[in-house]
Interface confidence: medium
């Protein structure tokens, strides 16, 4: 079976690899324009150059193209935490991350969050926080984990999965309600 | 057609409580990532909550945490935010808003409802 291709695969796939088909002319292989720039006329006629402009500032392109317009440069989100580690060039767009000490939580595919790593007060460091990974953390005795935060027994209620872990604590809170109530 | 529509707002003392609401429709709710947005008077938009499709993980903005828990029941296509401890800083109105899917922010909001913390 051959696989499906859009109708520019398959008009690029006529010419050699750094060349795309005229889209007035399939007889004629323009080259295609450096990341950096973009397509502004095709090429005239066959081992003629293709014109290409530089990318105007705020936009890009990463890679070789015959794009008639270069993409517009990515922001970071401030309202998500987000900082520029690298301002968007004309052949690289913005880069974004997080600060010192703080994790991404992709939300979606392209789309993420900072937070603060988890120090894991009440309790110790199981795994070290990652770019991508918050902090995974082990509670002492006493704690249970909750938000991945090492929380006190006593705010543990019995319809929460903290029970198990607090089983001699609630026990206890269970025996002070009952003598309370005879 | 998408809706997100909010309730719950209202005058609250320091200190006090409320619990928010926003009943959603025309799309599959326990597919989405939920989040609570706000905006105070004069202010730019500022993010409060989130949570997952199934009601995990949940995460808040340092300003809340603590104060504010973020919840859903799938079997009602509902978003909740249960605030206590009110400030006079949480003075905003709150938007209910789906998806958070691109670059470009949140796929949907609701029309908002406004939570006033005042003496």
């Known amino acids: 079976l051959v696989p499906h291709l859009g109708d520019r695969e398959k008009r690029d796939s006529v010419c050699p690899q750094g060349k795309y088909i005229h889209p007035q002319n399939n007889s004629i292989c323009c080259t295609k324009c450096h990341k950096g720039t973009y397509l502004y006329n095709d090429c005239p006629g066959p081992g003629q150059d293709t014109d290409c402009r530089e990318c105007e500032s705020g936009s890009f392109t990463a890679s070789e193209n015959h794009l008639r317009h270069c993409l517009s440069c990515s922001k970071c989100r401030k309202e998500m935490g987000q900082v520029e580690i690298s301002s968007c060039t004309v052949d690289r767009d913005t880069v974004c991350g997080c600060r010192k000490n703080q994790y991404r939580h992709y939300w979606s595919e392209n789309l993420f969050q900072c937070f603060n790593c988890s120090l894991c007060l009440n309790g110790t460091v199981h795994l070290s926080c990652q770019e991508k990974q918050n902090t995974v953390c082990t509670c002492h005795a006493g704690f249970f984990l909750r938000e991945n935060e090492c929380v006190s027994c006593s705010n543990c209620k019995k319809s929460l999965e903290c029970t198990k872990l607090c089983l001699p604590q609630i026990e206890n809170v269970k025996g002070t309600e009952d003598s309370g109530t005879t | 057609e998408v809706q997100l529509l909010e309730s719950g707002g209202g005058l609250v003392q320091p200190g006090g409580s409320l619990r928010l609401s926003c009943a959603a429709s025309?799309?599959?709710?326990?597919?989405?990532?939920m989040h609570w947005v706000r905006q105070a008077p004069g202010k730019g938009l500022e993010w409060v909550s989130g949570?997952?499709?199934?009601?995990?993980?949940?995460y808040y903005a340092d300003s809340v945490k603590g104060r504010f828990t973020i919840s859903r029941d799938n079997s009602k296509n509902t978003l909740y935010l249960q605030m206590n401890s009110l400030r006079a800083e949480d003075t905003a109105v709150y938007y209910c808003?789906?998806?958070?899917?691109?670059?470009?922010?949140?796929?949907?909001w609701g029309q908002g409802t406004l939570v006033t913390v005042s003496s």
């Open positions: 025309g799309f599959t709710f326990s597919r989405e990532n």
């Open positions: 949570i997952g499709p199934r009601g995990m993980p949940t």
């Open positions: 808003a789906k998806g958070m899917n691109s670059h470009d922010g949140f796929d949907y």
